[in-house]
Interface confidence: low
Amino acid sequence: GDTRPRFLWQPKRECHFFNGTERVRFLDRYFYNQEESVRFDSDVGEFRAVTELGRPDAEYWNSQKDILEQARAAVDTYCRHNYGVGESFTVQRRVQPKVTVYPSKTQPLQHHNLLVCSVSGFYPGSIEVRWFLNGQEEKAGMVSTGLIQNGDWTFQTLVMLETVPRSGEVYTCQVEHPSVTSPLTVEWRARSESAQSK
Amino acid sequence: IKEEHVIIQAEFYLNPDQSGEFMFDFDGDEIFHVDMAKKETVWRLEEFGRFASFEAQGALANIAVDKANLEIMTKRSNYTPITNVPPEVTVLTNSPVELREPNVLICFIDKFTPPVVNVTWLRNGKPVTTGVSETVFLPREDHLFRKFHYLPFLPSTEDVYDCRVEHWGLDEPLLKHWEFDAPSPLPETTE
């Protein structure tokens, strides 16, 4: 294989937004290999060496009035500007989740099982998934994959409930998400094999 | 207080491969990247291009600067090379699997550096190229990389799939397997 040594340079310009664009923090960061060497932080107001490797750059950039002024203005000229350009298709993007409930194994009643609530294809990632048994929230015995980013501007998550289903029981998966005004619910009845959407 | 949103302009330049990347990230998703060979902006979702524009030439200029700066830093560091960090690989589907219902296999390659990987989809052990797609290298908060590869497929009980990943941090190619997990049939006596 190719065993030549590799050398990597990674600049990152980060804009962190709090409460819309009310508070903005700009970071201009430079990484050699995996190590940050120098950065500008708008909360600091000047370039700082993170490692000795970045000291010449910090000193040089701080000595250049134009570079420093440009960096100090970036919260507005760069961050707030880009937020405004992209807001409609990023910040405001909403995609409704698809909710499906199924048992992980097809087991007879009164056998230990795992009920799966699959929530997929949603955006943004903030979501609340709850399990109810006969209208009462189940807080114990819940296992989750956590939030999974699909890389295509959608998320998915699986929230499992460890249970021993009994005849007549109604299990409900409830999903709250910014794309919907009221929670989405899907029921699974211990008698039936299929989940029906409400 | 945790921020609501983060936008990152992430770039890299890698020697001696002379590979570079310029992309914008919003909360961990790619908004666009610039195709260095075609010198054009590639929007992650086609509709994004209807709302905004980005002059690709600016990214090319940045990459030229990145290349020069990498040479400076390489020398300044007394030619200290990067340490290979091997990827973690996960294969999952886009949505719950139903037989003969179109779905997408996702190969998620995570926590690796440098940003060079060779990824191959295998169906029943043979390479598949039809319909496959991939993302560029995506930044992580720890300054390692992530990458997604996709394979649209029709789930069946006959086919098995593997995502095969090669990286300098791995001693041998890493294969992550996926196959249809058919639920065992209900005993007839159930009720």
């Epitope: 000291r55 010449p56 750059d57 040089y60 | 030229a64 040479e71 020398k75």
Partner: antibody, heavy 120, light 109 residues
Framework: QVQLKESGPALVKPTQTLTLTCTFS??????????VGWIRQPPGKALEWLAL???????YYSTSLKTRLTISKDTSKNQVVLTMTNMDPVDTATYYC????????????WGQGTLVTVSS | DIVLTQPPSVSGAPGQRVTISCSGS????????VTWYQQLPGTAPKLLIY???QRPSGVPDRFSGSKSGTSASLAITGLQSEDEADYYC?????????FGGGTKLTVLG
């Protein structure tokens, strides 16, 4: 403040060796990233880069003049010396030394230049 | 060796805008920063623009630099008589600094 000054003979004969000294102040050639270079300019012509020495004693030379040039530094004296062998009348020029504040950086401060005439 | 190509001369009337081009290749301008120097008659060159488009302190904002691919340009707006000088572009090619042939700017009138 940063200052550089070139010194050396104003007149050299063909085939002789030219030795030029650049004495500088206001910065140190031991600072990471810093370099000192030599550039010349024949009368009425363009600037031509000759050589550069950087903080860790790496030396870079113009391809076309490489065999004739030697650059060295004395960090304690704040001096950089350029020697050029086998001088020819076409080497008649104003010779400048200049500082580069970072590796592969621009020349941000220049000396006033010294005119060297090559004639028998 | 002159590796970067500049027009030998440009001219403009006071108050006008002029541009000076500098053409190179992938291995120099295409891969590295571009610097511009101003040389007034009988003096040493002075740094005007570095890192493609950055102005050192004290350089008026009438001077601006840009780079696109393997070419760069220097723009001077609101031309003044004291801008009459020679202008040189400079970049880097592998381990070598490279200069342009210089452009003489004449301010008319």
């Amino acid at each position: 403040q940063v200052q550089l000054k070139e010194s050396g003979p104003a007149l050299v004969k063909p085939t002789q060796t030219l030795t030029l000294t650049c004495t500088f102040s206001g910065f140190s050639l031991s600072t990471s990233g810093v370099g000192v270079g030599w550039i010349r300019q024949p009368p009425g012509k363009a600037l031509e880069w000759l050589a550069l020495i950087d903080w860790d004693d790496d030396k870079y030379y113009s391809t076309s003049l490489k065999t004739r040039l030697t650059i060295s530094k004395d960090t304690s004296k704040n001096q950089v010396v350029l020697t050029m062998t086998n001088m020819d009348p076409v080497d008649t020029a104003t010779y400048y030394c200049a500082r580069s504040p970072r590796y592969r950086g621009a020349f941000d401060y220049w000396g006033q230049g010294t005119l060297v005439t090559v004639s028998s | 060796d002159i590796v970067l190509t500049q027009p030998p001369s440009v001219s403009g009337a006071p108050g006008q805008r002029v541009t000076i081009s500098c053409s190179g290749s992938e291995s120099n301008i295409g891969a590295n920063y571009v610097t511009w120097y101003q040389q007034l008659p009988g003096t040493a060159p002075k740094l005007l623009i570095y890192d493609n488009n950055q102005r050192p302190s004290g350089v008026p904002d009438r001077f601006s630099g840009s780079k696109s691919g393997t070419s760069a340009s220097l723009a001077i707006t609101g031309l003044q008589s004291e801008d009459e000088a020679d202008y040189y572009c400079q970049s880097y090619d592998y381990d070598h600094y490279v200069f342009g042939g210089g452009t003489k700017l004449t301010v008319l009138g």
